[in-house]
């Protein structure tokens, strides 16, 4: 008689995700010199070892904590860019740019990128089936308690100016309920974060409104005043050609707008 | 400059305490997960007690009971209470510093010797 299962209204665990982890972590360490020495096996202990057998909406930070420390890695505190609802362009942006980094440019991001898991309740089993869904279960569950963390400790850990790409097609360009919103904006640490650069990708062709005075922006710069931390925008009306121009800075149509 | 100074140290009989204290300079303490470690003559440097920058606090299974760990972000110090010290304690005791990514910092360790 098969056991009953908990059903959630999210999507289950990714398919090999063990597996992935592990292949993930290798080929990272590979390719990054600095981490040669993390122990792959290790770190997909620790990452079992914060969901499996735990009931997948009483997640904690703290579960996570011996794969934060295993994950330790220094990065530069001025060349981070965070994002909000524009991750691929954030990715390509730092693919090229490579001296700054995204959170899924350190490996702890890379690992899970795009993945999902829960275990279950005194179980060793991973849930294939379904997990929880942030809004319609659970806050508390290992995917958002993961990024949660991971993300509050990737802003606290911002120097200087901190860069953030946000999508301008949105209805919120700026949303207090997203990660960048609610988790990164508050865990600036004003002592050492001088200003955050906003850059508001455009979506349509011709579309040469100022969406620096978007009202949602406009908000965004009310909270990061309010930390005393000083707030800046640009508009970046062609997505296609910054790319290129973050490539061949030289090229001559680089020295306008874009 | 990242500085980590261990205070507090010194000779102690069986049964004695000790309070020491690590005052940091150059970094914003309470971000920092910190800890004490230590490395008696001949071994590994090993766990003795943490504090998340959150304050969950977890010891080594040889202290429990005896050690306690804190912090004050404010005074940008992490301090760890020794009572009840056995010989076995006798060691030099680090502090550390460590965040998943702005770095991981240590002290220069001060000495603590429990003998009658």
């Known amino acids: 008689v098969p056991r009953w299962r908990q059903q959630w209204s999210g999507p289950g665990t990714t398919k090999r995700f063990p597996e992935t982890v592990l292949a993930r972590c290798v080929k990272y360490t590979e390719i990054h010199p600095e981490m040669r020495h993390v122990d792959c096996q290790s770190v997909w202990d620790a990452f079992k070892g914060a969901f499996i057998s735990k009931h997948p909406c009483n997640i904690t930070e703290e579960d996570y904590q011996p794969l934060m420390k295993l994950g330790t890695q220094t990065v530069p505190c001025n060349k981070i860019l965070l994002w909000s609802r524009i991750k691929d362009l954030a990715h390509q942006f730092t693919q090229v740019q490579r001296d700054m980094f995204t959170l899924e440019d350190t490996l702890l991001g890379y690992l899970a990128d795009d993945l999902t898991w829960c275990g279950e309740f005194n179980t060793s089993k991973i849930n294939y089936q379904s997990c929880p869904d942030w809004r319609k279960d659970c806050s508390n569950n290992p995917v958002s308690v993961f990024w949660k963390t991971v993300s509050r400790r990737f802003a606290e850990a911002a120097c200087d100016v901190v860069h953030v790409m946000l999508n301008g097609s949105r209805s919120k360009i700026f949303d207090k309920n997203s990660t960048f919103g609610s988790v990164e904006v508050h865990n600036l640490q004003p002592e050492k974060v001088q200003t955050l650069e906003a850059w508001v990708i455009h979506g349509g062709r011709e579309d040469s409104r100022d969406l620096c005075q978007d009202p949602t922006i406009k908000e965004l710069e009310s909270i990061i005043s309010k930390r005393n931390i000083q707030f800046s925008c640009k508009n970046i009306y062609r997505p296609d050609k910054f790319l290129q121009c973050v490539k061949n800075p030289e090229d001559s149509s680089c020295t306008s707008e874009i | 400059q990242v500085q980590l100074q261990e205070s507090g140290g010194g000779l102690v009989q069986p049964g004695g305490s000790l309070r020491l204290s690590c005052a940091a300079s150059g970094i914003i303490l309470r971000i920092y997960d910190m800890g004490w470690y230590r490395q008696a003559p001949g071994k590994q440097r090993e766990l003795v007690a943490a504090i998340t920058s959150r304050g969950s606090t977890n010891y080594a299974d040889s202290v429990k009971g005896r050690f306690t760990i804190s912090r004050d972000n404010a005074e940008n110090t992490v301090s760890l209470q020794m009572n009840s010290l056995k010989p076995g304690d006798t060691a030099v005791y680090y502090c550390?510093?460590?965040?998943?990514?702005?770095?991981?910092?240590w002290g220069q360790g001060t000495q603590v010797t429990v003998s009658s």
């Open positions: 550390n510093a460590d965040h998943t990514f702005a770095g991981v910092y």
